[in-house]
Interface confidence: medium
């Protein structure tokens, strides 16, 4: 079944390759368990970056190697997206899955799109 | 080191309940980040999940036996327990308790089964 | 529910063989794809979680591979404590289900 999810349209990362942003669905039901993942599509290529599985109520947590943090509160997602380059610049998408209980429901937003500026390097002093 | 140990096996009649009993040690049931779970395995058979368990009693069933099927933990003792009602003979099976990391999306750790018989 | 079916049932080697299991699924479960060997009379233990990652403890000449609906465990070069029964499970969506198992006997 399909379920709306809202994400922002666009965001900058800051110059130390961060960038964080919202991603809310319309639960039809009360989920139990919710499974949150984020998705990059860059010149027609989707790869998932990364995913995570939380329980209503409790923390969010990305494994440990993910360059993904985030907290949850209520039917919104909190996303941090770290270690960012020029070249990962692209589109963001948030697809949230109610794993359960049953119906299931699936939504995928209209995507973020981030962009990234590598720092100017610092000039050498003389 | 974690362990698990299931309890309660032997042989249940036809048509009565069985329960069964996980009790961790070497680490708490009561962390956010795991699922504690029931599988069975009937006798020369494939593996089936039963169902999962979260320290805050948040269930999850198989649909197929969610109508026989009761999954509770007891944080204060550090066990989670299967009651299986209604029992036939095709619920003989070695039953094994494990543990369900949430995000590795897999059960990383078992006990060593035990089985169920239901004959009369 | 999601249907996993593993090929070959059963499966006969020699140490020192490179073997593959392969694991398809009804329809797509992205990554979420685990492999467990089970041995007689023991739980089964895990190999590998999210289709490819081994788990720690494991020996590296076990390898995952796939996403989407089609999967494969490779084990490089078979040892006398490989021979066992090897099963995949989805853990995509509820309820989690497993393939039939692969027996791989010693030639």
């Known amino acids: 079944k399909a379920m709306h999810v809202a994400q922002p349209a666009v965001v900058l990362a800051s110059s130390r390759g961060i960038a964080s942003f919202v991603c809310e669905y319309a639960s039809p039901g009360k989920a139990t368990e919710v499974r949150v993942t984020v998705l990059r599509q860059a010149d027609s290529q989707v790869t998932e970056v990364c995913a995570a599985t939380y329980m209503m109520g409790n923390e969010l947590t990305f494994l440990d190697d993910s360059i993904c943090t985030g907290t949850s509160s209520g039917n919104q997602v909190n996303l941090t997206i770290q270690g960012l380059r020029a070249m990962d610049t692209g589109l963001y998408i948030c697809k949230v899955e109610l794993m359960y209980p049953p119906p299931y429901y699936l939504g995928i937003g209209n995507g973020t799109q981030i962009y990234v500026i590598d720092p100017e390097p610092c000039p050498d002093s003389d | 080191q974690l362990q698990l140990q299931e309890s309660g096996g032997g042989v249940v009649r036809p048509g009565g309940s069985l329960r069964l009993s996980c009790t961790v040690s070497?680490?708490?049931?009561?962390?956010?980040?795991?699922?504690w779970g029931w599988i069975r395995q009937p006798p020369g058979k494939g593996l089936e999940w039963i169902g999962n368990?979260?320290?805050?009693?948040?269930?999850y069933y198989n649909p197929s036996l969610k109508s026989r099927v009761t999954i509770s933990v007891d944080t204060s003792k550090n066990q989670f327990s299967l009651k299986l009602s209604s029992v036939t003979a095709a619920d003989t099976a070695v039953y094994y308790c494990?543990?369900?990391?949430?995000?590795?999306?897999?059960?990383?750790?078992w006990g060593q089964g035990t089985l169920v018989t239901v004959s009369s | 529910d999601i249907q996993l079916t593993q090929s070959p049932s059963f499966l006969s080697a020699f140490v020192g063989d490179r073997v593959t299991i392969t694991c398809r699924a009804s329809?797509?479960?992205?990554?979420?794809l685990a492999w467990y060997q089970q041995k007689p009379g023991k739980a089964p233990k895990l190999l590998i979680y999210?289709?490819?990652t081994l788990q720690s403890g494991v020996p590296s000449r076990f390898s995952g591979s796939g996403s989407g609906t089609e999967f494969t465990l490779t084990i490089s070069s078979l040892q006398p404590e490989d021979f066992a029964t090897y099963y995949c499970?989805?853990?995509?969506?509820?309820?989690?289900?497993f393939g039939q198992g692969t027996k791989l006997e010693i030639k």
């Open positions: 499970q989805q853990l995509n969506s509820y309820p989690y289900t």
């Open positions: 999210t289709a490819s």
């Open positions: 070497g680490g708490s049931i009561s962390s956010s980040s795991y699922y």
């Open positions: 329809q797509g479960i992205s990554r979420y």
């Open positions: 494990a543990r369900r990391r949430i995000q590795l999306w897999s059960f990383d750790y």
């Open positions: 368990i979260y320290y805050s009693g948040n269930t």
